[in-house]
Interface confidence: low
């Protein structure tokens, strides 16, 4: 056997080159036939009325033909024949690759709630061979479950990803990425997650700055509540007691003027949105005012007093998150 060919893989719409090569030429006739065994070229003559076939080279040792605008129907075995005695035959297989026509990502819900499991589907339509779909959440690769549908030698792949979302996932892209021999580089589509989560509540003491609350002083607390959607309600209550009459509530701020011992207690900031409720507690302890000593008549005495105040803020969440205790020494 001294007739040789090579298999050809080509992307749909591109050019395939078929070559029939003769090792030891004796000027025998070379012929190229299509999968239906119709003659494409007999020597340098083309009897087939398909102008997509063009002669690239003809000699006693090679018949080289190009096929432009290859379609899936061109796939199959092409036969080279060498009319020696006895005749020789060799075949080359043309494989046509079809990139996915369309890549669609479909997310079950536009907006998800933290802790919820959502379904994301990605479909790569009409490719050959079947497309491999990979999933990423941000940079992390995740596992999807793929189903392949075949229709007339073409494959549609749908991959399903079940995703449990957390508040940190808000704004993170979910990426469907395609791997296919006809696709160079990255073919991908993505959707950004929108995750709603219950408020996180923090109380900040904005006055007095040094944190020591004495009788007669003023106290101002600011409640910061962050959630998605932004908390609609931020309210102050006094736990197990009425709010002092001289307390002023202004949006997220609680202002108590002229503190006295009866103001001692726990003040709670509550915040809620459509996802849930959360609160943070501030324990107020009012200290005695600083004592003033009248100037002595004869002797001078120096007294040094050290006062330690502990300011405690307890954060809690009604949805079962861990609380945190912050203690500041002065």
């Amino acid at each position: 056997q001294n007739l040789f060919t090579k298999d050809v893989t080509v992307i749909e719409g591109e050019v395939a080159t078929i070559s029939c090569q003769v090792n030891k030429s004796d000027d025998s006739v070379i012929q190229l036939l299509n999968p239906n065994r119709q003659t494409i070229y007999f020597r340098d003559f083309r009897p087939l009325k398909d102008s997509r076939f063009q002669l690239l080279n003809f000699s006693s040792s090679e018949l080289k033909v190009s096929l432009t605008n290859v379609s899936i129907s061109d796939e199959g075995r092409y036969f080279c024949q060498l009319y020696t005695d006895p005749p020789q035959e060799s075949y080359t297989t043309i494989t046509v690759l079809v990139p996915p026509r369309n890549l669609m990502i479909d997310i079950q819900k536009d907006t998800a709630v933290e802790g919820e499991e959502i379904e994301v589907n990605c479909t790569a339509m009409a490719s050959k061979p079947a497309t491999t779909i990979r999933w990423f959440k941000g940079n992390t690769e995740l596992k999807g479950k793929s189903e392949v549908e075949e229709w007339s030698d073409m494959y549609t792949v749908t991959s399903q990803l079940m995703l449990k979302v957390h508040k940190e996932d808000d704004g993170v892209p979910v990426i469907c990425q395609v791997e296919h021999p006809a696709v160079t580089g990255n073919l991908q589509t993505q959707r950004y997650l929108e995750v709603q989560y219950k408020p996180q509540v923090h109380i900040q003491m904005t006055y007095p700055l040094q944190g020591l609350t004495r009788e007669g002083d003023a106290l101002e607390l600011t409640c910061e509540a962050i959630g998605k959607p932004q908390p609609v309600m931020v309210t102050w209550v006094r736990v197990d007691d009425e709010m002092p009459q001289h307390a002023v509530l202004s949006g997220p701020n609680l202002f108590i003027n002229n503190l006295n011992k009866t103001d001692n207690g726990t003040y709670r900031c509550e915040a809620s949105n459509i996802v849930g409720k959360a609160h943070s507690d501030y324990m107020l302890y009012v200290y005695d005012p600083p004592t003033t000593i009248p100037p002595p008549t004869t002797t001078t005495t120096t007294t040094t007093t050290t006062t330690t105040t502990i300011l405690t803020i307890i954060t809690d969440s009604r949805a079962g998150e861990e609380g945190s205790i912050r203690a500041v020494d002065h």
């Epitope: 959440k137 941000g138 940079n139 992390t140 690769e141 995740l142 596992k143 957390h166 940190e168 996932d169 808000d170 993170v172």
Partner: antibody, heavy 116, light 111 residues
Framework: QKQLVESGGRLVTPGTPLTLTCTVT????????MSWVRQAPGKGLEWIGV?????STWYASWARGRFTISKTSTTVDLKMTSLTTEDTATHFC????????????WGPGTLVTVSS | SFVLTQPASVQVDLGQTVSLTCTAE??????ASWYQQKPGQAPVLLIY???SRPSGVPDRFSGSSSGNTATLTISGAQAGDEADYYC?????????????FGGGTQLTVTG
């Protein structure tokens, strides 16, 4: 020939900053990420971080703030600060993400010893 | 942070098949990879994306994954397979993206 060689490992005292360099041959850093992994003597492997072709970096939570990865066209640096004796380890650089198809080229490693 | 659990040591007779396991809650959704490391050498990638083998790795090494467990199977164990084997995976939510290695399994080939 594709190869990676780490350098810069030496004996340092606690608190001393140190920069390790991974010199790259035959690998296009505009096409591949590069990872740093370390291994304390007699212990297992520990991921430090990765730098992608775009220049974006990701770090292990314990390394964030203390370790910085940067690159030129032929080198990848690992800058380490506030070193403690716990950081004594052989440091490897490797092509690609850990677990990635291209993560099959690793350097021989360079030893960092932190001791007072 | 999450933990990948591997048995500390496993023994296999020469020529036999051995399976090394790696378990973690994240493995049901994240891919596992496997590395072989011999004393004084850098790790070598054996398996990536649960089951894929880089070129040059003998087909005696194969990977599989089911639920929370990834498995590296070595068929026809050879003396040269004696080494530490590490599994690894990635996981993360939002910007906290992490790669983690298991503690490693020391494989001893006897006979």
């Amino acid at each position: 020939q594709k190869q990676l060689v780490e350098s810069g490992g030496r004996l340092v005292t606690p608190g001393t900053p140190l920069t390790l360099t991974c010199t790259v041959t035959g690998i296009d850093l505009s096409s591949h990420g590069m990872s740093w992994v370390r291994q304390a003597p007699g212990k297992g492997l520990e991921w430090i971080g990765v730098i992608y072709p775009s220049g974006s970096t990701w770090y292990a939570s314990w390394a964030r703030g203390r370790f910085t990865i940067s690159k030129t066209s032929t080198t990848v640096d690992l800058k380490m600060t506030s070193l403690t004796t716990e950081d004594t380890a052989t440091h490897f650089c490797a092509r690609g993400d850990v677990g990635g198809a291209d993560n099959n080229i690793w350097g021989p490693g360079t030893l960092v010893t932190v001791s007072s | 942070s999450f933990v990948l659990t591997q048995p500390a040591s496993v023994q296999v007779d020469l020529g036999q098949t051995v399976s090394l396991t790696c378990t973690a809650e994240t493995l049901s959704r994240s891919y596992a990879s496997w590395y072989q490391q011999k004393p004084g050498q850098a790790p070598v990638l054996l398996i990536y994306r649960d089951t894929s083998r880089p070129s040059g790795v003998p087909d005696r090494f194969s990977g599989s994954s089911s639920g929370n467990t990834a498995t590296l199977t070595i068929s026809g164990a050879q003396a040269g397979d004696e080494a530490d084997y590490y599994c690894a995976t990635s996981d993360g939510s939002g910007s906290s993206y992490q790669y983690v290695f298991g503690g490693g399994t020391q494989l001893t080939v006897t006979g």
